[in-house]
Interface confidence: medium
């Protein structure tokens, strides 16, 4: 039994780090392998992670960690019974993948404006709480070409857009993801999407003006 692709890990900079690797053949990860991890300088126990299968030869392990400090460094030992297959280290602050935002809601009660709000996935005392920026993806369920990304570079987890920028009378979906420039993180996973019906109606004069404008072209 050998490691084909060495473990690579990402941290949510809060309480979970996820490590993935590939073996050289089909493996029952949870029964055959153990990933031991220990904070450098730690005088307590090494913690054991029981991996799960991630495809035939792939394994994934979710390492429970304490709040991350930027200088934290973990030793990682991958064992198959009494055989040490791989030894490495992992510094969570250098491999951050933020948690996905949650509670994405589309507020349509203001006739000409859509307000999208979501929740910051971190508590206020976490360093990333004040360092996340977001990307909001809005797309039409009817038209695959109607696909747009809005970058939210301010701290407030919300986005206002004019309802008129979207087609009226059709359904849209939205989702949001996050990243933090300070730790050069990867993007988070997308949040679950939310759906709404865009029922915006342009005022008559504006509607007329648009047609007139179009006619002149």
């Amino acid at each position: 039994m050998k490691v084909l692709q060495e473990p690579t890990c990402v941290s949510d900079y809060m309480s979970i780090s996820t490590c993935e690797w590939k073996m050289n053949g089909p493996t029952n990860c949870s029964t055959e392998l153990r990933l031991l991890y220990q904070l450098v300088f730690l005088l307590s126990e090494a913690h054991t992670c029981i991996p799960e299968n991630n495809g035939g030869a792939g394994c994934v392990c979710h390492l429970l960690m304490d709040d991350v400090v930027s200088a934290d460094n973990y030793t990682l030992d991958l064992w198959a019974g009494q055989q040490l297959l791989w030894k490495g280290s992992f510094k969570p602050s250098e491999h951050v993948k933020p948690r996905a935002p949650g509670n994405l809601t589309v507020h349509t009660n203001v006739s000409d404006t859509l307000l999208l709000t979501w929740s910051n996935p971190y508590p206020p005392d976490n360093y990333l709480y004040n360092h996340l920026t977001y990307a909001v993806n809005i797309w039409s369920e009817n038209d695959p070409a109607d696909f747009r990304i809005y970058n939210v570079t301010y701290l407030e987890p919300s986005l206002r857009i004019a309802a008129s920028t979207l087609k009226s009378g059709i359904s849209y979906r939205a989702r949001v993801r996050a990243w933090a420039q300070c730790y050069n993180t990867t993007w988070s996973e997308w949040s679950p999407s939310t759906k709404w019906h865009n029922s915006y109606r342009e005022p008559f004069e504006q509607h007329h003006h648009h047609h007139h404008h179009h006619h002149h072209h």
């Epitope: 300088f41 005088l43 307590s44 930027s70």
Partner: antibody, heavy 119, light 108 residues
Framework: EVQLVESGGGLVQPGGSLRLSCAAS????????MSWVRQAPGKGLVWVST????????SYPDSVKGRFTISRDNAKNTLYLQMNSLRAEDTAVYYC????????????WGQGTLVTVSS | DIQMTQSPSSLSASVGDRVTITCRTS??????LAWYQQKPGKAPKFLIY???TLAEGVPSRFSGSGSGTDFTLTISSLQPEDFATYYC??????????FGQGTKVEIK
């Protein structure tokens, strides 16, 4: 419930020896690092010694190095501090403490045992 | 060795007051700092670790902040049971541990 109970303190003459014990219960003793910390009357906390979970690694400040020895018996769930060549300045309450699961901070402490070095 | 300087060494305050204690280290310890509370004749109690994370069961009126070399323990509204001595302790780069000299919080 985590409990740490120190014993073995008392009055000893300068140059004498004493062995402190700390009986641990309520947690898996063999997986935790342990430490001794002392506090002279009316003074602050001073770290005295540390041992890792399997007893393979120990450390001491210069003030006690060569005179004090920390050890543990994981089968008996007991931590020890052997103190030799005692001096008047070693007079203090001695606490045993457990290291926190994730960090090298001390999350549980015993009630302490008083060591008095005096002629 | 890393030196720890706590200030003030003592302070007088009333119930309901906001109390702030500072701890300064001689070199960068990131967030590897803990705070303890000790009452007369009792063992120290673990309050805060990682400079800001409350230990289990510690009331939310306690908070910690800071990183690098400057750290603060704040009690937002002092309660009668909070009159005690408070110690900071670093745990960066063992095998040495150092405590601050303590701050005694007394009744005004």
């Amino acid at each position: 419930e985590v409990q740490l109970v120190e014993s073995g303190g008392g009055l000893v003459q300068p140059g004498g020896s004493l062995r402190l014990s700390c009986a641990a219960s309520g947690f898996t003793f063999s997986t935790y690092g342990m430490s001794w910390v002392r506090q002279a009357p009316g003074k602050g906390l001073v770290w005295v010694s540390t041992i890792n979970s399997n007893g393979g690694s120990t450390s001491y400040p210069d003030s006690v190095k060569g005179r004090f020895t920390i050890s543990r018996d994981n089968a008996k769930n007991t931590l020890y501090l052997q103190m030799n060549s005692l001096r008047a300045e070693d007079t203090a309450v001695y606490y045993c403490a457990r290291f926190f699961r994730f960090r090298n901070a001390m999350d549980y402490w015993g009630q302490g045992t008083l060591v008095t070095v005096s002629s | 060795d890393i030196q720890m300087t706590q200030s003030p060494s003592s302070l007088s305050a009333s119930v309901g007051d906001r109390v702030t204690i500072t701890c300064r280290t001689s070199e960068n310890i990131y967030s590897y700092l803990a705070w303890y509370q000790q009452k007369p004749g009792k063992a120290p109690k673990f309050l805060i670790y990682n400079a800001k994370t409350l230990a289990e069961g510690v009331p939310s009126r306690f908070s910690g902040s800071g990183s690098g070399t400057d750290f603060t323990l704040t009690i937002s509204s002092l309660q009668p049971e909070d009159f005690a001595t408070y110690y900071c302790q670093h745990y960066y780069g063992p095998p040495t541990w150092t405590f601050g000299q303590g701050t005694k919080v007394e009744i005004k």
